[in-house]
Interface confidence: medium
């Protein structure tokens, strides 16, 4: 009675920089005692490694065992349902989990006012799990880009979209005053990774910040 349980319908990775989470959908009609076994295969080492014997959640954080993702050929994962002595067939991720699957994020966006300009500083992610030498800028060392969406408040429309190739930028306001809200989405021009919009940061610009120079 080894394969009486149905297999998890799908298994996939959702990853950000050094935050690699495996997800799966539950088997239909699972019982309270159903749990899931997780195994991992590293490309180049053709054997499956058992990671968790009995996870009762529908996700598993694999960051600690995939720390070399950015220097490897990637991974596959598989999950099967277990209920007492019964277990299902394995469901394997249908794509290779590699650096290409990592969704790019920024740590934060800092805004300040300087001589009537809005100065923006994009802070890169600094996850605790990352090895000391594996910084975002060392792994994505070239062609980092950022889309910037600027919204003027009041009014919910996006004021403008810009693309920059640096973590610092200054916004010329040309006498515009009010609250300006900025979001940033990272990308790497030479890669196909998806990017995620940052949390919106806002700053107020008032008349007092302007000085006229001839």
């Amino acid at each position: 009675h080894g394969t009486e349980l149905p297999s998890p319908p799908s298994v996939w990775f959702e990853a950000e920089f050094f935050h690699h989470i495996l997800h799966w959908t539950p088997i239909p009609n699972q019982s309270e005692s159903t749990c899931y076994e997780v195994a991992l295969l590293r490309y180049g080492i053709e054997s499956w490694n058992s990671i968790s014997n009995c996870s009762q959640t529908l996700s598993y954080d694999l960051t600690a065992v995939t720390l070399d993702l950015y220097h490897s050929n990637g991974y596959r994962a598989r999950v099967r349902a277990v209920d007492g002595s019964r277990h299902s067939n394995w469901t394997v991720t249908n794509t290779r989990f590699s650096v290409d699957e990592v969704t790019l994020t920024v740590g934060s966006v800092n805004l300040e006012i300087h001589n009537g300009f809005i100065l923006g500083k994009i802070q890169l992610p600094r996850p605790k799990m990352a090895p000391a030498n594996d910084t975002y800028e060392s792994i994505f060392s070239h062609f980092r880009e950022y889309e910037i969406a600027i919204r003027k408040v009041p009014g919910n429309f996006t004021f403008t979209h810009k693309k920059v190739k640096h973590e610092n930028f200054s916004l010329l306001t040309s006498g515009e005053v009010g609250e300006f809200c900025v979001q940033v989405k990272p990308s790497v021009a030479s890669r196909s990774n998806k990017g995620m919009w940052s949390k919106e940061e806002c700053i107020s610009l008032t008349r007092q910040y302007f000085t006229v120079t001839n």
Epitope: T160, K162, H166, S170, L172, G175, T213
Partner: nanobody, 134 residues
Framework: QVQLQESGGGSVQAGGSLRLSCAVS????????MGWFRQAPGKEREGVAA???????SYADSVKGRFTISKDNAKNTLYLRMNSLKPEDTAMYYC????????????????????????????WGQGTQVTVSS
């Protein structure tokens, strides 16, 4: 310190064309915001056109459709192509620049239709005279 040197001014008949150039000496020119301004005798200096490091352009209403601002990052040069010139375009034309943030980066205009404001611009050239006769 950034140095700006305009050239290309001169006298032209109404309906004619000129191309102004502004040679920029300074670090990382491609990341600057650049603009053209003009000042007619007895009048305020006014913004004509500007371009940011991303290539976004902004024009004064009075020159839209007639003037084109562009830059050549390889040559560190800013241009203003002026077509269908009118006598009211007669003025001294100045090139101006805004450097990027202190620790490097890009200078950007906040919006696509932001007016060109001299309050933003930090560095100025000496100017080149344009005279349009009817």
């Amino acid at each position: 310190q950034v140095q700006l040197q305009e050239s290309g001014g001169g006298s032209v008949q109404a309906g004619g064309s000129l191309r102004l150039s502004c040679a920029v000496s300074g670090y990382a020119y491609s990341t600057y915001c650049m603009g053209w301004f003009r000042q007619a005798p007895g009048k305020e200096r006014e913004g004509v056109a500007a371009i940011d490091s991303g290539g976004s352009t902004s024009y004064a209403d009075s020159v839209k459709g007639r003037f084109t601002i562009s830059k050549d990052n390889a040559k560190n040069t800013l241009y203003l192509r002026m077509n269908s010139l009118k006598p009211e375009d007669t003025a001294m034309y100045y090139c101006a620049a805004v450097p990027p943030p202190p620790d490097g980066g890009s200078c950007l205009f906040l919006g696509p239709e932001i007016k060109v404001s001299k309050a933003d611009f930090r560095y100025w050239g000496q100017g080149t005279q344009v005279t349009v006769s009817s």
